[in-house]
Interface confidence: low
């Protein structure tokens, strides 16, 4: 595929990445799939600066990110190492709370109203943020 050098329409460029901010809600898996169909992934937060950028754009609204522990350990969807990477959990989080009555614990991470992170039931219909890196190979065929 061709190399993407600028962001798609309605995406926001920042630090050589492109971001798309939803204004509707989906379950985490549906949001994850949406981003993948856009040749992107749910946002992966690698620095405090990126955290603040995303926070600035989403405002005080619960919003999914590309972090989950549905298979055991916490993992970023793009393979970024969780243990050594940036984290911004709320106090006492993640807690894998079972008391919500929806079955199971809490396996998906989202930005809360103050930007810090919480784990929640993956089926909740939250907004989401997609991210794709500039300069990576696009799956779209080159324009002739």
């Amino acid at each position: 595929g061709s190399e993407r050098t600028c962001c798609p329409v309605n995406w926001v460029e920042h630090e050589r990445s492109c971001y798309w901010f939803s204004r509707s809600g989906k379950a985490w898996a549906d949001a994850d799939n949406y981003c993948r169909l856009e040749d992107a992934h749910l946002v992966v937060v690698t620095s405090w600066e990126e955290q603040k950028f995303v926070q600035h754009h989403i405002g005080p609204v619960n919003t999914w990110m590309g972090l989950h522990d549905q298979n055991g350990p916490w993992k970023w969807v793009d393979g970024t190492d969780y243990e050594t990477g940036f984290k911004n959990w709320r106090p006492e989080q993640p807690d894998d709370w079972y008391g919500h009555g929806l079955g199971g614990g809490e396996d998906c991470a989202h930005f809360t109203d103050d930007g810090r992170w919480n784990d929640d039931v993956c089926q909740r219909p939250y907004r989401w943020v997609c991210e794709t890196e500039l300069d990576k190979a696009s799956q779209e065929p080159p324009l002739l």
Partner: antibody
Framework: QVQLVESGGGVVQPGRSLRLSCAAS????????MHWVRQAPGKGLEWVAV????????YHADSVKGRFTISRDNSKNTLYLQMNSLRAEDTAMYYC??????????????????WGQGTTVTVSS | EIVMTQSPATLSVSPGERATLSCRAS??????LAWFQQKPGQAPRLLIY???IRATGIPARFSGSGSGTEFTLTIYSLQSEDFAVYYC??????????FGGGTKVEIK
């Protein structure tokens, strides 16, 4: 007026502990992130640690990780640095500084805009 | 860790002249850079944040510019009180927050 005053420095033997304090006045302490920054004699500035406005998050430099702990008591308008297992290389002037970028309200207005005058820590046998 | 490199280490300037200080980051820090001034026996003082935004009370003769990896602090028409050590500091990728080694601006 806005002021930060450090205390608790002194001469201490290697391996011993010390707790620094930073008393804040003239502003809403609980709305600001706070840092400790140190400066060895004749050297440049070295960031030591940061704590969020509400104490919920804190980070330490690798050089002090596992030995130093930053904390705060918003009811007392005071920032702390607990220093354990002190080494000769920890000898420095220690400054506290506030930073709105890690505060309650302003996400983009970064900058250590108010500093204390510092407290001297000397680690020597 | 992002390494900040300042040059020159010492800059000799006459009062009234312009001083140009450089700061280079080992990788991009966007515009997330601050400049501090420190006089002997005193705490550092914030001059610039966001690469070019003057902090409260800082005179207009202090000007910051740059983005990415290359930054400049320009002091126009140096006053006697401007002779000091100047540090740059990045807050883009951390921990750790990192400072440059400093540039001493001395009287020529």
């Amino acid at each position: 007026q806005v002021q930060l005053v450090e205390s608790g420095g002194g001469v201490v033997q290697p391996g011993r502990s010390l707790r620094l304090s930073c008393a804040a006045s003239g502003f809403t302490f609980s709305s600001y992130g706070m840092h400790w920054v140190r400066q060895a004699p004749g050297k440049g500035l070295e960031w030591v640690a940061v704590i969020w406005y509400d104490g919920s998050n804190k980070y330490h430099a690798d050089s002090v990780k596992g030995r130093f702990t930053i904390s705060r008591d918003n009811s007392k308008n005071t920032l702390y640095l607990q220093m354990n297992s002190l080494r000769a290389e920890d000898t420095a002037m220690y400054y506290c500084a506030r930073d709105e970028g890690f505060g309650e309200f302003d996400y983009y207005n970064y900058g250590m805009d108010v500093w204390g005058q510092g407290t001297t820590v000397t680690v020597s046998s | 860790e992002i390494v900040m490199t300042q040059s020159p280490a010492t800059l000799s300037v006459s009062p009234g002249e312009r001083a140009t200080l450089s700061c280079r980051a080992s990788q991009s820090v966007s515009r997330n850079l601050a400049w501090f001034q420190q006089k002997p026996g005193q705490a550092p003082r914030l001059l610039i944040y966001g690469a070019s935004i003057r902090a409260t009370g800082i005179p207009a003769r202090f000007s910051g510019s740059g983005s990415g990896t290359e930054f400049t602090l320009t002091i126009y028409s140096l006053q006697s009180e401007d002779f000091a050590v100047y540090y740059c500091q990045q807050y883009n990728n951390w921990p750790p927050l990192t400072f440059g080694g400093g540039t001493k601006v001395e009287i020529k």
